[in-house]
Interface confidence: low
């Protein structure tokens, strides 16, 4: 082992370095002192550090560590924040266009139903937006309300346009008849199924992205313990006390310290991995009736079909409802009052579908691919931080927390540290409360994501297949068939897709650079002068 270099007889270098951290020199000894009051940088001989300096070093070390952690997560944080915003806006645009489409359908095909229809459509899509953003609304209720509201207008304007004003007090009866007589056939049920499935998935997708932001924000702003602060001080600053200004910590030693400091954070790793994989599974299933873009942009067509269905049966319906709602607002009727053969819906169901065009689904897949590159983010954090802070290459001629060594030995370092501080103890303390809370939230979202992940290769659920919907023939010239007649597949209609080029240029080059990061104590960071890696906030 080489002898330590001769100590600075005047502590001059230490004084000039420390002055960058703390203007004024009152805490720095002019010449080396015994340092018997030191608690972290325990001296083997005379030292240029005082207890006050040690405290300042500890504070600075913890601040540096927080900066390093923020720097490490910056790219990932930017990726999720940007995507959450982009997708939220994209979904809102889809809803807006779906509303425009539906209004246009009414305007072009049923002008007599406007403006009431516009009002009902507007309310429905407002609810859709609110639901996606997490509002506690029942999708079935939304769809029921839309059809309950539409039917009285359809009945009085389309089916019975000559109805005297005195008969217009039958709205409540008509609303009830709508459900009991299934006047729209199975279309409301079909819309409920499609809308609820696609919106549930959309909603949890956004929830998951927002939780991702919360996870990063939580770990980004962790306050490191005093024990960790002491370890970091010993690694980064105690060498200064001996006048070893240019010495870098040993890489292996840095890894040991970081694993100790990050022990709680690293516990997130298992749940973070599961989060990304579960999100991927969810995204892989977001197609056809699980893709809100498909479903909502095709709604105008299904609603149109449902009104045509009413018109097709208008004759029998008018007779039946005339009897049921004749002179009373009271609902005296029952489903049995209408002939059983009246509402058999043989209509082919159309689900909006587009072959693999560049739409939101490809954006989602792109996000997942980027996220997967961060799957080991938490387990790799200690190593990442060491590689982005000044450490000695090859563990040669480096600082091991006590002295300058020719080669780092983890065993020797551990033995030497036993009387000062027990690394094992730090690891055994378990994660901080905030980390435990975020782990619980990750467990919860992972469970939700798993519940929502759809079985592959199915277009509709089994229970929907059993509703009596039929695949029909592939005759309409604007329709196409997917799959054979006996495989549970259904006829689909091509739909326009918006948002093909939704701004999504989230290259890392666009991420705010370190220079833009808030560094409240820049003067404290400069301690590392030119030792920092180019990516390190410690430069």
């Amino acid at each position: 082992q080489p002898p330590p270099p001769p100590p600075d007889a005047t502590c001059h270098q230490v004084r000039s370095f420390f002055q960058r951290l703390q203007p004024g020199l009152k805490w720095v000894p002019e010449t080396p002192v015994p340092g018997s009051d030191l608690q972290v940088c325990l001296p083997k001989g005379p030292t240029c550090c005082s207890r006050k300096m040690e405290e300042k070093y500890q504070l600075t070390a913890r601040l540096n560590m927080e900066q390093l952690l923020q720097s490490a997560s910056m790219e990932l944080k930017f990726l999720i924040i940007q995507n959450a915003a982009v997708f939220q806006e994209a979904f809102e645009i889809v809803v807006r266009h779906a509303k425009n489409y539906t209004n246009a359908m009414f305007k072009n095909n049923y002008p007599s139903l406007t403006p009431q229809a516009f009002e009902f459509v507007g309310e429905f899509f407002t609810d859709v937006s609110l639901y996606i953003l997490g509002s506690d609304i029942n999708v079935d209720d939304m769809v029921n309300e839309l059809f309950d509201s539409l039917f009285p207008v359809i009945y009085t304007q389309l089916m019975n346009p000559g109805l005297p004003d005195s008969a217009l007090d039958i709205n409540e009866c008509l609303r009830g008849a709508r459900r009991d007589l299934k006047v729209f056939g199975n279309f409301p049920k079909l819309i409920m199924t499609q809308v609820s499935k696609s919106l549930q998935v959309t909603r949890i997708f956004l929830q998951a992205l927002n939780l991702g932001i919360e996870v990063i924000n939580t770990t980004d702003h962790l306050k490191f313990s005093k024990d960790c602060g002491r370890m970091l001080t010993r690694m980064w600053y105690c060498s200064y006390c001996q006048g070893l200004m240019m010495v870098k910590p040993c890489g292996g030693y840095c890894n040991v310290v970081m694993q100790g400091c990050m022990a709680g954070v690293v516990e997130i790793d298992k749940y973070w991995r599961e989060y990304i994989l579960s999100l991927e599974e969810l995204v892989n299933g977001m197609y056809r009736i699980y893709d809100m873009e498909n479903v909502l942009l095709g709604l105008f067509s299904t609603i149109h079909d449902s009104i045509q269905y009413v018109q097709k049966n208008a004759g029998k319906l008018t007779t039946t409802i005339g009897k049921l709602c004749a002179h009373s607002q009271q609902r005296q009727y029952r489903s049995a009052y209408y002939p059983e053969d009246l509402f058999i819906d043989k209509k082919v169901l159309k689900v909006a579908h587009v072959e693999h065009e560049e739409t939101l689904s490809s954006r989602r897949r792109e996000l997942i691919q980027k996220l997967k590159s961060f799957i080991s983010f938490y387990s790799a954090l200690p190593g990442y931080i060491c590689s982005h802070s000044p450490v000695a290459e090859n563990d040669t001629l480096c600082w091991n927390g006590q002295e300058l060594v020719e080669r780092y030995s983890q065993k020797a370092a551990r033995n030497g540290m036993k009387n000062q501080f027990n690394l094992h103890e730090l690891k055994m303390k378990g994660p901080e409360p905030v980390v435990s809370q975020i782990i619980d939230k990750l467990k919860h979202i992972n469970q939700l994501l798993r519940t929502m992940s759809m079985p592959k290769g199915r277009v509709l659920d089994k229970n929907l297949d059993e509703e009596g919907f039929e695949s029909g023939d592939c005759g309409d010239d604007e329709d196409e068939c997917i799959g054979g007649s006996g495989d549970g597949m259904i006829k689909v209609k091509n739909q326009l897709r918006f948002l093909a080029e939704l701004a999504y240029d989230l290259d890392v080059d666009d991420a705010p650079g370190n220079s833009q990061q808030a560094t409240p104590k820049d003067n404290e960071i400069s301690t590392f002068h030119n030792l920092g890696n180019v990516h390190s906030p410690l430069k």
Epitope: V86, H97, L496
Partner: antibody, heavy 123, light 105 residues
Amino acid sequence: TVTLDESGGGLQLPGGALSLVCKGSGFTFSSFNMFWVRQAPGKGLEYVAEISGTGSSTYYAPAVKGRATISRDNGQSTVRLQLNNLRAEDTGTYYCAKGVDSDSWTAAGIDAWGHGTEVIVSS
Amino acid sequence: ALTQPSSVSANLGGTVKISCSGGTGRWYGWYQQKSPGSLPVTVIYSNDKRPSDIPSRFSGSTSGSTSTLTITGVQAEDEAVYFCGSRESSRNPGIFGAGTTLTVL
């Protein structure tokens, strides 16, 4: 009254880049989608790019995708089209156009046009 | 692609209809250009809406995937090329027809 003034055209070298700027006035700029449409000599109109009112959504025609970037500065009421790796077929008059609202129906929803700026790509 | 006739003619004061089909989005706009390179003027947007400075003789209607521009009481100054615009697919959200030359007789 709505006015749209384009600038930045002129003679460009193949493989080079051009930057066109359109300044809008007479309307609340940030509330409307903006477009670039071009017309090659003796040809019809060709959609180039579109940007939403906030700038968060962009759309590009296949002919320019990967080479074009549309951006906007609502503070300055300007929209910019950056077109890289220029080709002879990029020659034509480039028009700036205003959408009817902040989520217009792309080429179905233009209600005002600029006078255009001529771009010639030639060596 | 959008399909429109290459040329139509109309008598002064008469009525002319120009059709355009093929827009999968079923939303159309109509744009008038009096000479190549001059600024286009929107006569109809979003299927049937007319800018305030456009005379009421211009109207638009859409049925299914076909849009029709109707000019009733054609004037000499209406002689121009009329382009329809729509969107074809998410890969090509904006598209224009090749243009229809209106000749006033």
